[in-house]
Interface confidence: medium
């Protein structure tokens, strides 16, 4: 599923991401935009043999199990395919674990490069939330 901007903002808010670990909803929507272009089925392969999955491009070396990433830790204890569902529950729950890990949203390269320090509230402007 490819979410609309406000549709995703509403879903993320419903799942408790607004101000989760101090990160406003705009940060999460911005991250999703530049990680996956709001596409729940996005997959991207990395040079280390791992793959990023879903709307927040969660990595198989650390966070989920895709059955083929050497040394996978699967810290979210889920199959990576669960992160590709049109229901974003699994992605949100895993993202909460990631953002609580110590580096905050710096874990997402796209957030670091495209969202951090910008007017992230623009990503939820005009949305009925």
């Amino acid at each position: 599923k490819v979410f609309g901007r406000c549709e995703l903002a509403a879903a993320m808010k419903r799942h408790g991401l607004d101000n989760y670990r101090g990160y406003s909803l705009g940060n999460w929507v911005c991250a999703a935009k530049f990680e996956s272009n709001f596409n729940t089925q996005a997959t991207n392969r990395n040079t280390d043999g791992s793959t990023d999955y879903g709307i927040l491009q969660i990595n198989s070396r650390w966070w989920c199990n895709d059955g083929r990433t050497p040394g996978s830790r699967n810290l979210c204890n889920i199959p990576c395919s669960a992160l590709l569902s049109s229901d974003i529950t699994a992605s949100v729950n895993c993202a909460k674990k990631i953002v609580s890990d110590g580096n905050g949203m710096n874990a997402w390269v796209a957030w670091r490069n495209r969202c951090k320090g910008t007017d992230v509230q623009a990503w939820i402007r005009g949305c009925r939330l």
């Epitope: 089925q41 997959t43 040079t47 043999g49 895709d66 059955g67 083929r68 050497p70 395919s81 590709l84």
Partner: antibody
Framework: QVQLQESGAEVMKPGASVKISCKAT????????IEWVKQRPGHGLEWIGE????????YYNEKFKGKATFTADTSSNTAYMQLSSLTSEDSAVYYC?????????WGQGTTLTVSS | DIELTQSPATLSVTPGDSVSLSCRAS??????LHWYQQKPHESPRLLIK???QRASGIPSRFSGSGSGTDFTLSINSVETEDFGMYFC?????????FGGGTKLEIK
């Protein structure tokens, strides 16, 4: 136990298309990548590409882009590979395998012969 | 693409001999190297994963070693059922690639 059952041998004319199937049993089909591999005598094994059935995400070896197309039907736990514009170079045995990085589980292979 | 070069192309041995098969990668692939055996008209069978881990049900006479670019499959005291083709495969990057194979034949 994990099993991959491929469709039977095919004899096709040059220029035609063929669709090979790979039915998976014994594991959660949507969770693992299905890989496709080509084997021709004297050419060893070649990786064609892969599909994640749960999402339909696909990756192709550049060499096979435009030649192979992957699909999957999660209701029947079956992956498909269509090969188009067949030539004699496509005559080979085609395997599906479960993508664990390594390939512990293979189909029995589908022999494709392209001949006029 | 990562090239895998296997040597020798053919190895003629007598049952009871011990042999080593080589697989060399064109660039470092850490331990992401796997070995397969294939008999005529059969699918490949996984022997060794991640350079040195024996796959389920594989006899202890098969062992693997190496890291980076140089890898070895060793068969201690070859048995008649071991004859066939041996392939290596890398999963360090895409596209996945295979070696050209080593044929193990009876002398």
């Amino acid at each position: 136990q994990v099993q991959l059952q491929e469709s039977g041998a095919e004899v096709m004319k040059p220029g035609a298309s063929v669709k090979i199937s790979c039915k998976a049993t014994g594991y959660t089909f949507t969770t693992y990548w299905i890989e496709w591999v080509k084997q021709r005598p004297g050419h060893g094994l070649e990786w064609i590409g892969e599909i994640l059935p749960g999402s339909g995400s696909t990756y192709y070896n550049e060499k096979f882009k435009g030649k192979a197309t992957f699909t999957a039907d999660t209701s029947s736990n079956t992956a498909y590979m269509q090969l188009s514009s067949l030539t004699s170079e496509d005559s080979a045995v085609y395997y599906c395998a479960r993508g664990d990085g390594f390939y512990c589980y293979w189909g029995q292979g589908t022999t494709l012969t392209v001949s006029s | 693409d990562i090239e895998l070069t296997q040597s020798p192309a053919t190895l003629s041995v007598t049952p009871g001999d011990s042999v080593s098969l080589s697989c060399r990668a064109s660039q470092s692939i850490s331990n992401n190297l796997h070995w397969y055996q294939q008999k005529p008209h059969e699918s490949p069978r996984l022997l060794i994963k991640y350079a040195s881990q024996r796959a389920s049900g594989i006899p202890s006479r098969f062992s693997g070693s190496g890291s980076g670019t140089d890898f070895t499959l060793s068969i201690n005291s070859v048995e008649t059922e071991d004859f066939g083709m041996y392939f290596c495969q890398q999963s360090n990057s895409w596209p996945r690639t295979f070696g050209g194979g080593t044929k193990l034949e009876i002398k």
